[in-house]
Interface confidence: low
């Protein structure tokens, strides 16, 4: 996270780290004791296998991640249209062998409902242990931000994206840059209080560099997603 | 605005994944056309930010809020694992309907053993002129002590 | 730069309604990152905390001043308002409104300069 | 409600000290706490949030650590214009409360 602040403890308690060989890749969020929605793109070919993966939940700092509750994975579902190139559908869901124990540090956020407005520039906040700026290491604490939603005709814009977003994509971040997701954030959320919940509304999936003017950055489109979500959780539960 | 487009006629239903459109009155018809066959496990949902429990009726080729009537919490954990929270059930209660709804899903009680949707049909009165809303999961909440808010 | 300002009455009668606004400007009252409170301060004693608001309406008030109190927000005049009724000499205080970050870092971070309400006959 | 109580209820100091005022939760908070300046007839003004976190413009001799129950706000060389009283909030559970503050005088 480009220009964020470090979480306190219990502030994003969704957020889950995926780590590959003892490595952080990838965010995840929880959405069940048993299921974790990170991004298609993370579980590409060759890491499209359960067994690389675990997920570690409730702890704050990747170097004290093994302190902290540590699933392995059972199964990885990428989203049966995710496309590599474009980045479309960049969605996918991770079954846990044991399932989570909820406490002040591990909950799940809630997935969106139809019929849900947002807001022209809907506050919203990324989360994760990416980059603090482009082309830096992950970060060792887990850091978050605030980003206003872009409504897509507006990121479609010559000036922006010039047509790269699709419905199944939603742009979040500040026109003039400063504050955006990078890279090692993928696969973590972008959620939005409302009612005074927190809901689900994006997996963190691409941009053009982090923190870049008029390069704000994407995410999967989680409400576009509920229906195969809730799909895949009634077929391999 | 909605972060919402969908491929299909007004008429018609989506089928997902598969992105495959279907007349809206074979929906929830009980006969699988989608696919993966989500137009027969895709007939409850919950809706909007206050999570009412809606039905989709194939008759009438829309959802609806499922009346407070009769309503236990038995059948809202019946609804969750519908939905796909097979472990999974927070709360089930009524709410006011704020919607102005004029038309209902309601339970009919004496339908016997039968599939929750089955028990169900379309009505123009609820009097309780409550919805029922289910929360399958205790979701986006920060701290076990914020949620007395 | 977001400012709050508090207006309102300085006497209020005994048993009559406290009633008070507070406008906010350089910034949107309908924004889900804050919650606006109203926190009060006798004379020569400390600081409590009698409610908040969120642009959606939903509200918060401490328990004893529950049943007296009322915070409502208008939207369309970028302001949001205290109601107390049936007040006595005891809820004569410098009331000060003030934006309550909501998600995670919390603390009162902007305030309004206070306004004195005395309640006297 | 939670109350919290701040230790001393005065302090008398010179410019230069090291001042150190505590808050005690009467239950566990995490990191939900946040501290303020109020001088004579102004407004109350953020120093620290999220317990130990300097709110942007702060000088940085104020600093807050703690974490649970026990919390601590140290002035590391007092200045005259940090004369002033000090108030603790919780925001974990509402009511939110404040202490009942700690007025640091000149010796």
């Known amino acids: 996270i480009v220009g964020g602040l470090n979480a306190s403890p219990g502030d994003w308690p969704w957020q889950v780290s995926l780590h590959v060989q003892g490595v952080h890749v990838c965010g995840g969020s929880i959405i069940t004791p048993e299921w974790i929605v990170t991004a298609a793109h993370c579980v590409e070919e060759p890491l499209s296998s359960p067994r690389y993966w675990t997920a570690f939940a409730g702890i704050l700092r990747q170097s004290l991640m093994f302190y902290g509750s540590r699933h392995q994975v059972e199964k990885v579902i990428s989203h049966p249209n995710y496309d590599s190139k474009t980045k479309n559908n960049d969605i996918a869901l991770m079954k846990l062998q044991t399932p989570l124990a909820f406490n002040d540090l591990v909950k799940p956020v809630c997935l969106p409902n139809p019929g849900m407005m947002l807001d022209l520039d809907q506050e919203c906040w990324i989360s994760g242990w990416g980059a603090t700026y482009e082309k830096g290491k992950t970060s060792d604490v887990l850091n978050a931000a605030m980003v206003p939603l872009i409504e897509p005709s507006k990121c479609n814009s010559k000036y922006i994206y010039n047509n790269l977003i699709t419905p199944a994509m939603i742009c979040a971040g500040f026109l003039q840059g400063s504050v955006d997701s990078c890279q090692g954030d993928s696969g973590g959320p972008l959620v939005t209080l409302k009612n005074g919940i927190w809901w689900l509304i994006g997996d963190t999936s691409w941009g053009s560099g982090c923190a870049k003017a008029l390069r704000p950055g994407v995410y999967g489109n989680v409400t576009v997603f509920t229906d195969w979500i809730y799909q895949q959780m009634r077929a391999n539960s | 605005w909605r972060f919402w487009d969908s491929n299909c006629s007004t008429s018609e239903m989506e089928c997902g994944s598969s992105g495959t459109c279907i007349s809206s009155s074979l929906w929830c018809d009980g006969v699988a056309h989608c696919p993966n066959g989500e137009d027969e496990n895709r007939c409850v949902r919950l809706y909007g930010q206050s999570f009412i429990l809606q039905v989709y009726s194939s008759q009438r080729k829309a959802w609806y809020p499922v009346c407070q009537d009769d309503w236990s919490e038995s059948y809202g954990r019946a609804a969750c694992k519908d939905m796909g929270y097979k472990n999974n059930f927070y709360s089930s209660q009524g709410i006011p309907d704020q919607s102005g709804a004029t038309s209902f899903m309601k339970l009919n009680v004496s339908s016997g053993n039968v599939d929750l949707y089955k028990k169900l049909y379309h009505s123009d009165s609820c009097s309780s002129r409550m919805v029922v809303s289910l929360r399958c999961i205790e979701c986006g909440v920060r701290s076990v002590k914020r949620q007395s808010r | 730069q977001l400012q709050l300002q508090e207006s309102g009455p300085g006497l209020v009668k005994p048993s009559e309604t406290l009633s008070l606004t507070c406008t906010v400007s350089g910034g949107s009252i309908n924004s889900n990152s804050y919650y606006w409170g109203w926190i009060r301060q006798p004379p020569g004693k400390g600081l409590e905390w009698i409610g908040s608001i969120y642009y959606d309406r939903n509200t918060y008030y401490t328990p004893s001043l529950k049943s007296r109190v009322t915070i409502s927000v208008d939207t369309s005049k970028n302001q949001f308002s205290l109601k107390l009724t049936s007040v006595t000499a005891a809820d004569t205080a410098v009331y000060y409104c003030?934006?309550?970050?909501?998600?995670?870092?919390?603390?009162?971070?902007?305030w309004g300069q206070g306004t004195t309400v005395t309640v006297s006959s | 409600d939670i109350q919290l109580t701040q230790s001393p209820s005065f302090l008398s100091a010179s410019v230069g000290d090291r001042v150190t005022i505590t808050c005690w939760a009467s239950?566990?908070?995490?990191?939900?706490l946040a501290w303020y300046q109020q001088k004579p007839g102004k407004t109350p003004k953020l120093l620290i949030y999220?317990?130990?976190t300097l709110q942007s413009g702060v000088p940085s001799r104020f600093s807050g650590t703690g974490s649970g129950t026990d919390f601590t706000l140290t002035i590391s060389n007092l200045q005259p214009e940090d004369f002033a009283t000090y108030y603790c909030q919780q925001f974990d559970s509402y009511p939110w409360t404040f202490g009942q503050g700690t007025k640091v005088e000149i010796k």
């Open positions: 003030a934006r309550e970050q909501v998600p995670g870092y919390y603390g009162m971070d902007v």
């Open positions: 239950q566990g908070i995490s990191r939900y």
């Open positions: 999220a317990a130990s």
